[in-house]
């Protein structure tokens, strides 16, 4: 079948990194420069992905491979294949059109990216507040209250886990 | 190879929104970023903006406020509304694979004209 | 956002002859990869715009080996060493360092 289909097309001969040139007879040319075909039988190749402005290269493109993208120090990616850069903030601070700003008092961003998330409600668990929490750190529950009074036992239950949207990303 | 064909209606009113759809065939819609241009007749080209497939957009500053790009990778398509359309806004809409984000237009659709007009 | 300049606008030209068009750009399109970030288009009548250069010189594949691209910068070139019949049309010069990307006015080439 293979053979077959190689006769009715040319094209289909023609490997990764090459294209089939119909301006030469269906032959199998390179690919141009800065240009890739991934798979056989194109019949064109690709133009690679240029990584400019905010985008650096992480992957330089290759005849058979497109370019791949990172973000310049002080922007981290957004998106798969990092389609967009974003700002980096500081910890504590997250990112509004008008640019960094504090966390509001109530929540806290421990890393360079994201939004500000509220400090776990120890209460909620019937937990204590151990160690307050800070614009870069989420609060630390301790035991709760009765777990404290003389007499109580001294093993714990552990801990439920916490909601998704506190977990580290 | 990849072919892209853009639809939609080609009468918009006076200050309606102008929607289009450009589907991808012959390759996923998955990879690249895809671009809207338009030429009013008899006149020269205007990028308006792209969509990678993940979702983040980019729009020209001069239309940003009317222009809202959007993607369905399930279909293999992706849309341009535009809205408080004119008649300036007369144009063929060209859907393209863009390969770079802003760059080097590899594929066009064949264009469809959309009339603003009461 | 930058400003592209095509000359001349309108090129006749006898078939097996060769024909130049110029482009220059606001600002320099040479970027610190070492790449010239401008395309080229050819636009036929009643179809829509096809690549024909990319990053300033290079062909993209399919396109016959009479065109060419040349320049630096801000000053651009696109050269098709002997015009045929089919390269009637008109083409187009875009920048696409920055977004968005700009599109000069575009030369219209016809057959003397």
């Known amino acids: 079948f293979e053979r077959t289909r190689s006769l009715q097309d040319p094209c289909s001969n023609c490997p990764a990194g090459t294209f089939c040139d119909n301006n030469r007879n269906q032959i199998c040319s390179p690919c141009p420069p800065n240009s890739f075909s991934s798979a056989g039988g194109q019949r064109t190749c690709d133009i690679c992905r240029q990584c400019k402005g905010v985008f650096r290269t992480r992957k330089e493109c290759s005849s058979t491979s497109n370019a791949e993208c990172d973000c310049t120090p002080g922007f981290h990616c957004l998106g798969a294949g990092c389609s967009m850069c974003e700002q980096d903030c500081k910890q504590g601070q997250e990112l509004t059109k008008k640019g960094c700003k504090d966390c509001c008092f109530g929540t806290f961003n421990d890393q360079k990216r994201g939004i500000c998330r509220p400090w776990t409600n120890c209460s909620l668990d019937g937990k204590s507040v151990l160690v307050n929490g800070t614009k870069e750190r989420d609060v630390v529950c301790g035991p709760s209250p009765a777990d404290l009074s003389p007499g109580a036992s001294s093993v714990t239950p552990p801990a439920p886990a916490r909601e998704p949207g506190h977990s580290p990303q | 190879q990849v072919q892209l064909q853009e639809s939609g209606p080609g009468l918009v009113k006076p200050s309606e929104t102008l929607s289009l759809t450009c589907t991808v065939s012959?390759?996923?819609?998955?990879?690249?970023?895809w671009s809207w241009i338009r030429q009013p007749p008899g006149k020269g080209l205007e990028w308006m903006g792209y969509?990678?497939?993940?979702?983040?957009?980019q729009y020209n500053p001069s239309l940003k406020s009317r222009v809202t790009i959007s993607v369905d990778t399930s279909k293999n398509q992706f849309s341009l509304k535009l809205s408080s359309v004119t008649a300036a806004d007369t144009a063929v809409y060209y859907c393209?694979?863009?390969?770079?984000?802003?760059?080097?237009?590899?594929?066009w659709g064949q264009g469809t004209l959309v009339t603003v007009s009461s | 956002e930058i400003v592209m300049t095509q000359s001349p606008l309108s090129l006749p030209v006898t078939p097996g002859e060769p024909a130049s068009i110029s482009c220059r750009s606001s600002?320099?399109?040479?970027?610190?990869?070492?790449?010239?970030?401008l395309d080229w288009y050819l636009q036929k009548p009643g179809q829509s715009p096809q690549l024909l250069i990319y990053?300033?010189?290079n062909r993209a594949s399919g396109v016959p080996d009479r065109f060419s691209g040349s320049g630096s910068g801000t000053d651009f070139t696109l050269k098709i060493s002997r015009v045929e019949a089919e390269d009637v049309g008109v083409y187009y010069c875009?920048?696409?360092?920055?977004?968005?990307?700009?599109f000069g006015q575009g030369t219209k080439l016809e057959i003397k």
């Open positions: 393209a694979r863009d390969q770079s984000g802003g760059g080097s237009f590899q594929h």
């Open positions: 012959g390759g996923s819609i998955s990879s690249y970023y």
């Open positions: 969509i990678y497939y993940s979702g983040s957009t």
């Open positions: 600002q320099s399109l040479l970027y610190s990869n070492g790449y010239n970030h």
């Open positions: 990053l300033g010189s």
């Open positions: 875009m920048q696409a360092l920055q977004t968005p990307p700009t």
